[in-house]
Interface confidence: low
């Protein structure tokens, strides 16, 4: 988790002088509780936006937006703590909006936004906005949380972001797999425009079962430049096992930008259809 281009982040708006600060996610008001604390944020919204860095890279960011409740507690509102928790790693990153002037009621509802948390493809986050100061131990909670799921690199807009392109999202291998005679599979795919090696991972399964009955790995050496974007054809020999008929072919590239952590592509060959044997017609109606 990180912030996009930690340049001058602004939270000021007409009628409010505000600064954005790094936060340890442990606001001082936890340790020194105040008697009067503001109410919670209203209508917290998190959306996927895209932002360029100063270097021109494109990243997905969480666009966080919320409004204030129209009650007198805004007189005691000193700021807000924004927290983003990545659910699969428990990594948390926080920033603090510090209000440098008192808030006043005005004709429009106060609205705040922040779009600098960089998020990763295919990850889920919990976004929390805490109004400051935080409540006393038995006080009413004054925060709002929402979960936010970022699409993976298959998503059209995500595909062209820097993290997705770095993991090989622009490569479309267009895999085809056909079953040949004598227990063989012919795998064909389009090479990318990089002189790097590939691995074909074959896993076979019995019909309707998920434990494998055969596994095989095939190494494809790095193509020469004249072979870029050409089709590579590989014939794999299967084990002659009755019923080991469903085959998953996975192609793992080793691009320089993602090494052994590049996006993999796969194709599956189903078991051949069994010829229908006519069933005897029962002379009673089954009860299931």
């Amino acid at each position: 988790l990180r912030l996009l281009d930690h340049r001058a982040l602004v939270c000021s708006q007409p009628g409010l002088n505000c600064t954005v600060k790094n936060s340890t996610c442990l606001d001082d008001s936890w340790i020194h509780p105040r008697n009067l604390t503001p109410s919670s944020p209203k209508d917290l919204q998190i959306q996927l936006h895209f932002a360029h860095t100063q270097q021109g890279d494109l990243f997905p960011v969480a666009h966080i937006e919320w409004t204030l409740q129209t009650d007198a507690s805004i007189l005691y509102l000193e700021g807000a703590e924004l927290s983003v928790l990545q659910l699969n790693t428990n990594e948390r990153l926080c920033v603090r909006f510090e209000f440098l002037s008192k808030l006043r009621h005005h004709h429009r509802r106060w609205r705040f936004t922040f779009s600098h948390f960089v998020v990763d493809p295919d990850q889920e986050y919990e976004v929390t906005v805490h109004h400051l100061p935080k409540p006393i131990p038995d006080g009413d909670p004054n925060h709002q949380s929402k979960n936010f799921l970022v699409p993976d690199c298959e998503h059209a807009r995500m595909k062209v972001t820097t993290p997705c392109m770095s993991s090989g999202s622009l490569w479309d291998p267009n895999i085809t797999v056909e079953t040949l005679e004598a227990h063989q599979l012919r795998v064909s795919f389009t090479l990318w425009n990089e002189s790097t090696h590939y691995q074909i991972l074959l896993t076979s399964f019995p019909h309707m079962e998920n434990h494998s009955c055969f596994e095989h790995m095939h190494h494809i050496p790095a193509p020469r430049p004249e072979e870029f974007h050409q089709r590579s054809n590989v014939t794999l020999t299967l084990r002659n096992l009755k019923g080991c008929c469903r085959h998953q072919v996975q192609i793992q590239p080793f691009f320089s930008s993602c090494l052994n952590d590049c996006l993999r592509h796969s194709a599956t060959v189903s078991c051949p259809e069994m010829p229908d044997t006519p069933e005897p017609i029962p002379d009673y109606m089954p009860l299931w």
Partner: nanobody, 123 residues
């Protein structure tokens, strides 16, 4: 322009099923999460269900979990809501809504809404 058109509503008896459809036009349907939101007569808006851009992630309100199924067909630019075991409290105007690109959007942030289709559950 961006448009969402719902269909499939009607009068149905409690315990029966109904499928709502929503057809989208004017935007790249497969880029966005989609949602169903309902409004009972005289009541406020209630989020019902949402589905991510590729259909891999779905979410439901507790009140419909296990009874309703949301799905989408990106090729047909269509969103569906299969409603089983309908109850009288499911009576509402059902709206299809375009969400954000990530899931987790609040109904207030839905940028486009349909006109709604009325579902009445009564014996």
């Amino acid at each position: 322009q961006v448009q969402l058109v719902e269909s499939g509503g009607g009068l149905v008896q409690p315990g029966r099923s109904l499928t709502l459809s929503c057809t989208a036009s004017g935007f790249t349907f497969h880029d966005y999460a989609m949602h169903w939101v309902r409004q009972p007569p005289g009541g406020g808006l209630e989020w019902v269900a949402g589905v991510s851009w590729n259909g891999n992630n779905v979410g439901y309100a507790d009140s419909v979990k296990g009874r309703f199924t949301i799905s989408r067909d990106n090729a047909k630019k269509s969103l569906y809501l299969q409603m089983n075991s309908l109850r009288s409290e499911d009576t509402a105007l059902y709206y299809c809504a375009k969400g954000g690109m990530g899931s987790g959007s609040h109904p207030d942030s839905f940028s486009t809404w349909g006109q709604g289709t009325m579902v009445t559950v009564s014996s």
